[in-house]
């Protein structure tokens, strides 16, 4: 079951299991909607004189993507499939601007970590974005959580402003991203 938490005064809300931004700058305002609405994948809406959002309800717009901060706990693989069911992918961070936006969002959830779309088969093989593109450490470093008991953390999550590797089976929240064409 998904938690439902509403607050009129708080900066963020949790609706239908999704974390919504209340930032007004360049973001869509969250709408009251059913779970069915929030999980229906929709393409960018073509406007006919009426201004409409290219993102589905409950998704946040930033630059050329829509983002969904899912508050249902899942493994990395389960989170990936959940994003796919919504017509999207786990987050791929392409720029320092995008990284800054994501950090701003997740920093308001200091108790939670969010899976992103970076994984590898094992430590000898490089990190890979879900779409098959290469990972460059110029954008950010991945802080390792590897220990003798946990030698192969092969998936990646973000916690506040730090990006860590982690065991792929650990349940966590996640960030889905849906790119749209302007």
């Amino acid at each position: 079951t998904m938690a439902i938490w509403r607050s009129n005064s708080g900066s963020n809300t949790l609706e239908n299991g999704y974390f919504l931004s209340r930032n007004k700058e360049n973001h869509s305002q969250p709408t009251q909607s059913s779970l069915e609405d929030s999980v229906t994948p929709t393409k960018a809406v073509k406007t006919t004189g009426v201004l409409s959002s290219p993102c589905p309800p409950n998704w946040i717009i930033y630059e050329k993507s829509c983002y969904l901060f899912s508050m249902s706990l899942n493994s990395w693989d389960g989170s990936k499939r959940q994003c796919w069911q919504l017509g999207s992918n786990l987050l791929k961070i392409d720029s320092s601007n995008e990284l800054g936006f994501i950090v701003k969002q997740v920093s308001s959830q200091p108790d939670n970590s969010f899976w992103i779309g970076l994984s590898r088969p094992q430590t000898e093989v490089p990190w890979l974005w879900e779409d098959g593109s290469t990972f460059s450490s110029n954008l950010f470093q991945i802080r390792t959580t590897a220990t003798q008991e946990n030698p192969s953390p092969n998936c990646v999550w973000i916690h506040v402003s730090v990006i860590y590797d982690q065991l792929c089976s650990v349940p966590s929240y996640s960030i889905c991203e849906k790119k749209f064409s302007m």
Epitope: D77, P121, Q122, E124, V125, P126, L128, E130, D131, G132, S133, T134, S136
Partner: antibody
Framework: QVQLVQSGAEVKKPGASVKVSCKSS????????IHWVRQAPGQGLEWMGW????????NYAQKFQGRITMTRDTSISTAYLELSRLRSDDTAVFYC???????????WGQGTLVTVSS | DIQMTQSPSSVSASVGDRVTITCRAS??????LAWYQQKPGKAPKLLIF???SLQSGVPSRFSGSGSGTDFTLTVSSLQPEDFATYYC?????????FGPGTKVDIE
């Protein structure tokens, strides 16, 4: 759309070297690994290695170590495979392929036939 | 190196048949497995990645399953254009080895 176009067929003598090119278009060349795979006549597929076009980092199958070189020219979105000290059993079609999800090869060149014969 | 084996090595089938090909890895590879289709004189074509994810544009009659060491490619209803050779490939550790292939021909 994503396209990989390879150089034409080559005939080489044993002991010589061959350099095959693979020109990419339709995507950002530096964002995706390029795999090289070969297939001898009537045989299966054999992964030779890959190059990261962004960094130039390579990983070669042990079988080819010492006589294989993968390079790239980012200015023309082209990857190269060079195989030296050719033997007759190197006769094969050589394919380049662009990496996709889970390290699969999602887009392939048309193949380059290299014949090694005295 | 991880060895990949496929069975059967060849199978004769008719249009409309359900065809199943199995691939086994010599050690666990989680879900880092891909399936390819190749027709004579052509480059391979990616069908399935991550053991079960259908590549964009591939008909839904193709499906993949499995994890660890045992994997399956299923064609639910064979079409004339599906007669080809199918290869599995592990992408868990270097080198990324292929299986020997399974040829699907007309009965």
């Amino acid at each position: 759309q994503v396209q990989l176009v390879q150089s034409g067929a080559e005939v080489k003598k044993p002991g010589a070297s061959v350099k095959v090119s693979c020109k990419s278009s339709g995507y950002t060349f530096t964002d995706y690994y390029i795999h090289w795979v070969r297939q001898a006549p009537g045989q299966g597929l054999e992964w030779m290695g890959w190059i990261n076009p962004n960094s130039g980092d390579t990983n070669y199958a042990q079988k080819f170590q010492g006589r294989i070189t993968m390079t790239r020219d980012t200015s023309i979105s082209t990857a190269y495979l060079e195989l030296s000290r050719l033997r007759s059993d190197d006769t094969a079609v050589f394919y380049c392929a662009r990496n996709s999800g889970s390290y699969s090869a999602g887009y392939w060149g048309q193949g380059t036939l290299v014949t090694v014969s005295s | 190196d991880i060895q990949m084996t496929q069975s059967p090595s060849s199978v004769s089938a008719s249009v409309g048949d359900r065809v199943t090909i199995t691939c086994r890895a010599s050690q666990g590879i989680s879900s880092w497995l891909a399936w390819y289709q190749q027709k004579p004189g052509k480059a391979p074509k990616l069908l399935i990645f991550g053991a079960s994810s259908l590549q964009s544009g591939v008909p839904s009659r193709f499906s993949g399953s499995g994890s660890g060491t045992d994997f399956t490619l299923t064609v639910s209803s064979l079409q004339p254009e599906d007669f080809a050779t199918y290869y599995c490939q592990q992408a868990y550790s270097f080198p990324f080895t292929f299986g020997p292939g399974t040829k699907v021909d007309i009965e």
